[in-house]
Each structure stands twice: as C-alpha cells, then as structure tokens.
C-alpha cells in the first residue's frame, strides 16, 4: 500500500525535509527544528549551521536548505560559503600577521580586502605613465613617446617616495 | 501557539466528492506533516491519511482510491477531497498536526487538533 | 495494519477511585510512538500522553502511562468529574496510524 516506499529502496520517496525514519520501518519524519535535508531520499537531516560571532545570517535555515551566513561590518567572508570572516583594511593597505599595514610604495590596494599588488611597469608595453600610482590605485598608462605630438612631453615619472609605503602625493 | 480551524459543506450528496480545508493559524504550515482524521456518529477514531508541505501524501488503504490530499503553503492551509461518497462517510472530520520530533529527538504524537466538522452524506 | 484492543469497552467507576486501562498491539509498537487521548463528548481528542509515558502540555499529574511492546497502560490515580470521558490508544509507529477502539470511563 501507499506508505513511503519504492521497490527499490523504502527512502526514496521521502522529501526534502524529511528524513527516512529507522527508528519506526522506515517511515519519512519531518526534519527537527534547526536541522534540514536539501534532497530527498536522506537518512538524516543536517544540523543548521548557527552565524554566530562575526558571522550573521543571510539567509535563515528551513528544513529543505541550510542557513547562509555573511560577514559583520568591517569583515568579509573567506572560502567557500564563507566559511571564514577576514578583517576588512582600508584601501591602500593589505592585511598582514599584525593587523592591517599601508602598501610599500610601488605597490596598490584599491579593495578593503586582498593584498597589495606592483603598479603596472607601463615600460613593458611601450607606454608611459600618465597619470602615477598612490597606494590605493594603480599607475595610468598612456601612449608611447613616439606617439606624442611633435612639442608635446610624457608625464614625468614618479620621484622617490619621501617616506616608505608612500608614492608622492 | 497553532491553532486548526476546518471548513466546507456539511451536507454532501451520495456518489459526489466531499471537499474539506484545514487552516493553520498561529504558526507555519511548513515542516510538519498533517493528518485527517474521522469520527462516524458513536464509533471511533479513524486517519485518514497525512500530507507534508511538499505535497508527499500517505494515505489509509481502506480509503486510497477515493482519498486526494492537497496543500497550500502560500493560504497555511491543506485540503481533504473523499470521492464517490456514501453514508457510511457520514463522520465528523478532524484536523491534527502530525507527530513530529524536536531537536532532541523526542517525538511527539498528534499534539493540534482541529475542533471538527460534521458532514453528513445524505440526498 | 497494526491493529489496537482497547480494555475493557466500558469502565464504571466512582469519582475518587483509580482507574487502569488497556491498550494492545497486534505487533510490538516502539514506546516512542504511542500515544493517548481523551474525548470528551462533543469535543475533539485531546492528546493526553505521548511516548507512552510522558505527559502533554497541561495534563494534570494524576495521568500517567505506562507499557512497552504490545502492552500499554493508562491509569489515572483519582477519577475527578471531568475525567469520565472515552480514552483512545493510538500508535503512529508505522503506517497507517491505528487508533484503538477506546474506553469509556463512566460513573457508576
């Protein structure tokens, strides 16, 4: 008769949401609070996933999908799913062992996440800088010398940062 | 808390489909299977059958090839439909939430009931 | 389908005295699944035990049950007047769920 049961295999009609019950011949059960199944056929539900700390819950757990978590202010998620919340730093920093630290001159961050990157060597294309680098954004590459006008210049490039970690403002 | 409140005609004709709705206030129709179950004048208890959110369905084999169980989670409500009716489905029809466990794995029996609904099947 | 005897049919009693009912199962039910009910003419079944033993919300203490395998048990210690009512077994341990055919507590 009509109880949750195939031929083949008695849990495979059971829905997402529940679980094939071993506990009473196998008969589907709905899923406990705070836990789910994603498919059907499942012979347990899943506990939820609890966004606690600098973790927060984009999405509630239901008894068909697990909660989804986000970052809190001043963090971003890491890993799949965000498995991991990373410290945001400003742009023109990267994070390092001891906290957030300003990009060595010649280097950008334009994100509040990731690390520092070179400035673009416009030299290797043929080009020359246009406008310069800051620590928070990379160097404008423009035409090469020879495609300047007669009577027209390129942009001076850079001098010497006064001070490490800084391009001259 | 969830409170069960069914609904439909009360008089039903002999070979017609009797239609019965049970709605959900107070809490959410999902993650619970419901059941329906029966009460002849005098006699006992007898289920019907239940139905998950989802749509899955198991139904009494007495009653199987004339049961249909819908659900609709958008109105919290579910739905019984007994075709080809006779006398002998003159009952009053009730309700339940079904058993379900909590997070602990305590499982728990047909704690919500509707107060019922009297049909009788009569021409 | 597991088939439920309720005894006895029929229980006179006296406010005040102790009443034990029946309950067995055509085949061994697990405990976790049992559960009782009172009916009070009129009324919806109002679940009294769950688990064979525990209590539901609100159910006065002198409601207690007992039993394992195919034999249940619910006694209820002292008979107040809103006691008389009819009680049912019922097992949701597999499918179809199966109620028995219940006992009426009644005053002599």
């Known amino acids: 008769f009509e109880r949750t049961r195939s031929l083949q295999d008695p849990c495979s009609n059971c829905p997402a949401g529940t679980f094939c019950d071993n506990n009473r011949n196998q008969i589907c059960s709905p899923c406990p609070p705070n836990s789910f199944s994603s498919a059907g056929g499942q012979r347990t539900c899943d506990i939820c996933r609890q966004c606690k700390g600098v973790f927060r819950t984009r999405k509630e757990c239901s008894s068909t999908s697990n909660a989804e978590c986000d970052c809190t202010p001043g963090f971003h998620c890491l890993g799949a799913g965000c498995s991991m919340c990373e410290q945001d730093c400003k742009q023109g920093q990267e994070l390092t062992k001891k906290g957030c630290k300003d990009c060595c001159f010649g280097t950008f961050n334009d994100q509040k996440r990731g690390i520092c990157r070179p400035w673009t060597n416009c030299s290797l294309d043929g080009k020359s800088v246009l406008v310069n680098g800051t620590k928070e954004r990379d160097v404008v590459c423009g035409p090469s010398p020879a495609d300047l006008s007669p009577g027209a210049s390129s942009v001076t490039p850079p001098a010497p940062a006064r001070e490490p970690g800084h391009s001259p403002q | 808390q969830v409170q069960l409140q069914e609904s439909g005609p009360g008089l039903v004709k002999p070979s017609e489909t009797l239609s019965l709705t049970c709605t959900v206030s107070?809490?959410?129709?999902?993650?619970?299977?419901w059941s329906w179950i029966r009460q002849p004048p005098g006699k006992g208890l007898e289920w019907i059958g239940r139905i998950y959110t989802s749509g899955s369905t198991n139904y009494n084999p007495s009653l199987k090839s004339r049961v249909t169980m819908s659900v609709d989670t958008s109105k919290n409500q579910f739905s019984l439909k007994l075709s080809s009716v006779t006398a002998a489905d003159t009952a009053v029809y009730y309700c339940?939430?079904?058993?379900?466990?909590?997070?602990?794995?305590?499982?728990?029996?047909?704690?919500?009931w509707g107060q019922g609904t009297t049909v009788t099947v009569s021409s | 389908e597991i088939v439920m005897t309720q005894s006895p049919a029929t229980l006179s009693l006296t406010p005040g005295e102790r009443a034990t009912l029946s309950c067995r199962a055509s085949q061994s039910v697990s405990s976790n699944y049992l559960s009782w009910f009172q009916q009070i003419p009129g009324q919806a079944p109002r679940l009294l035990i769950y688990g064979a033993s525990t209590r539901a919300t609100g159910i006065p203490a002198r409601f207690s049950g007992s039993g394992s395998g195919t034999d249940f048990t619910l006694t209820i210690s002292s008979l107040q007047p809103e006691d008389f009512a009819v009680y049912y077994c019922q097992q949701d341990y597999d499918l179809p769920w199966t109620f028995g055919q219940g006992t009426k507590v009644e005053i002599k």
């Open positions: 107070g809490g959410s129709i999902s993650s619970y299977y």
């Open positions: 339940a939430r079904d058993g379900w466990y909590d997070e602990d794995y305590n499982y728990y029996g047909m704690d919500v």
